[in-house]
């Protein structure tokens, strides 16, 4: 008795759905009562299918309401694990174990990315020096570098800080600040570049006509 996994690596986006497959041999009609399927993620119980039904009692709380094993696929000899609304914490090594006459298991790796798509920006000016401060901020995973360029595609040196956001999801909150002498309508770009995947997302910042004053931090009268 041998099971097969068409893919041993799935790479999905945070918040999306994923379908991981393990196939097992079925002669003629599947006897659901004789089939046992377990899906685990490391030390967490994800799905337990016994005696023709999913047993939700042993399911780890982190998968509650998000992990499914479609029965129609089982009938075709396909133990499919569907996870909806994928979290960063879902990343890791999954194991499908199937007992149907004989028994076998396969390991499958799930990687989760969160692109830095939504880039927040701010432009302010220090009245004392007329220096502009350009800020780009975005959340994603894994860590990204922020590259600043001007309209001539020259690289500029910004200051990037990375913190783990306080959301339950533990996305990385990447903020980068560029201080630069600029005039109205000058164009700058901040690019969030994920080194390992090569994926990048860019925002355009245009210096406004009217200065946007920045309140001094500790002004004394």
């Amino acid at each position: 008795f041998t099971i097969t996994a068409p893919k041993d690596l799935y790479v999905v986006e945070y918040g999306s759905n994923v379908t991981m497959e393990c196939r097992f041999p079925v002669e003629q009609k599947l006897d659901l009562l004789a089939l046992v399927v377990y899906w685990e993620k490391e030390d967490k119980e994800v799905i337990q299918f016994v005696e023709g039904e999913e047993d939700l009692k042993p399911q780890h709380s982190s998968f509650r309401g998000r992990a499914f094993l479609p029965k129609d696929q089982l009938l075709k000899g396909n133990a499919v694990l569907q996870i909806t609304d994928v979290k960063l914490q879902d990343a890791g090594v999954y194991c499908c174990m199937i007992s149907y006459g004989g028994a076998d298991y396969k390991r499958i790796t799930l990687k989760v990315n969160a692109p830095y798509r939504k880039i927040n920006q701010r432009i302010s000016m220090d009245p004392a020096t007329s220096e502009h401060e350009l800020m780009c901020q975005a959340e994603g995973y894994p860590e990204a570098e922020v590259i600043w360029t001007n309209s001539d595609h020259q690289s500029l040196s910004g200051e990037t800080t990375v913190t783990t956001s306080q959301t339950e999801e533990k996305l990385l909150n990447v903020t980068s600040v560029l201080r630069v002498n600029a005039t109205a309508n000058d164009v700058f770009h901040c690019t969030f570049w994920r080194v390992h995947s090569g994926e990048n997302h860019t925002a355009e910042l245009i210096i406004p006509e009217l200065p946007v004053p920045r309140l001094p931090h500790n002004r004394t009268h």
């Epitope: 046992v36 377990y38 967490k44 119980e45 016994v50 042993p58 780890h60 194991c95 007992s99």
Partner: antibody, heavy 120, light 111 residues
Framework: EVQLLESGGGLVQPGGSLRLSCAAS????????MVWVRQAPGKGLEWVSS????????FYADSVKGRFTISRDNSKNTLYLQMNSLRAEDTAIYYC?????????????WGQGTLVTVSS | QSALTQPASVSGSPGQSITISCTGT?????????VSWYQQHPGKAPKLMIY???NRPSGVSNRFSGSKSGNTASLTISGLQAEDEADYYC??????????FGTGTKVTVLG
């Protein structure tokens, strides 16, 4: 109250066989992954074998693979460990243990253990 | 799979805090947040004190706490009491769906 009661331990000669039993009560036995863990006299704990709720899937430590067989009877709420070709190094207290619901290897309840002595 | 490394013994006076370390590798302790700690009094069965690195089962005193950094997990017992004198074992999930236990630490309460 969760209770796990081991029996079947004793003195056996090298090469001999022994069958350990563990009677479970106070919980829905058929929903839980169960394990055997042993402890040689004055030594640390060693995982021996695991069995999934249905009984169809089992895992063994390399040190006992091919010699020991774990099984369960969910209708009798009983876990078993058949030990063949016993060696002196198998001498230990054998604990039957329950795996915490939702996890795969975290033991949350242990029996009191049964002593197996392999000696000529 | 070799056992996780623990100090053979740790001692402290009543009321003090002590910490027991448990060092593994990047394949067990370092790879997963599934470290458990068990307390075992002489002649008794082990008892689960901490699971998933820092979670306490109901009924376990909040004087027991767990943490992890890199390949090393730690169990801290604060406000040490006479009944804390026992052997303590750490345990970690490994990539082969098995458990590896620590070598064990004997905790002695002085005085």
């Amino acid at each position: 109250e969760v209770q796990l009661l081991e029996s079947g331990g004793g003195l056996v000669q090298p090469g001999g066989s022994l069958r350990l039993s563990c009677a479970a009560s106070g919980f829905t036995f058929s929903s839980y992954l169960m394990v055997w863990v042993r402890q040689a006299p004055g030594k640390g704990l060693e995982w021996v074998s695991s069995i999934y709720p249905s009984g169809g899937i089992t895992f063994y430590a390399d040190s006992v693979k091919g010699r020991f067989t774990i099984s369960r009877d969910n209708s009798k709420n009983t876990l078993y460990l058949q030990m063949n070709s016993l060696r002196a190094e198998d001498t230990a207290i054998y604990y039957c243990a329950r795996i915490k619901l939702g996890t795969v290897t975290t033991v949350d309840y242990w029996g009191q253990g049964t002593l197996v002595t392999v000696s000529s | 799979q070799s056992a996780l490394t623990q100090p053979a013994s740790v001692s402290g006076s009543p009321g003090q805090s002590i910490t027991i370390s448990c060092t593994g590798t990047s394949s067990d302790v370092g790879a997963y947040n599934y470290v458990s700690w068990y307390q075992q009094h002489p002649g008794k069965a082990p008892k689960l004190m901490i699971y998933d690195v820092s979670n306490r089962p109901s009924g376990v005193s909040n004087r027991f706490s767990g943490s992890k950094s890199g390949n090393t997990a730690s169990l801290t017992i604060s406000g040490l009491q006479a009944e804390d004198e026992a052997d303590y074992y750490c345990s970690s999930y490994t990539s082969s769906s098995t458990r590896v236990f620590g070598t064990g630490t004997k905790v002695t309460v002085l005085g």
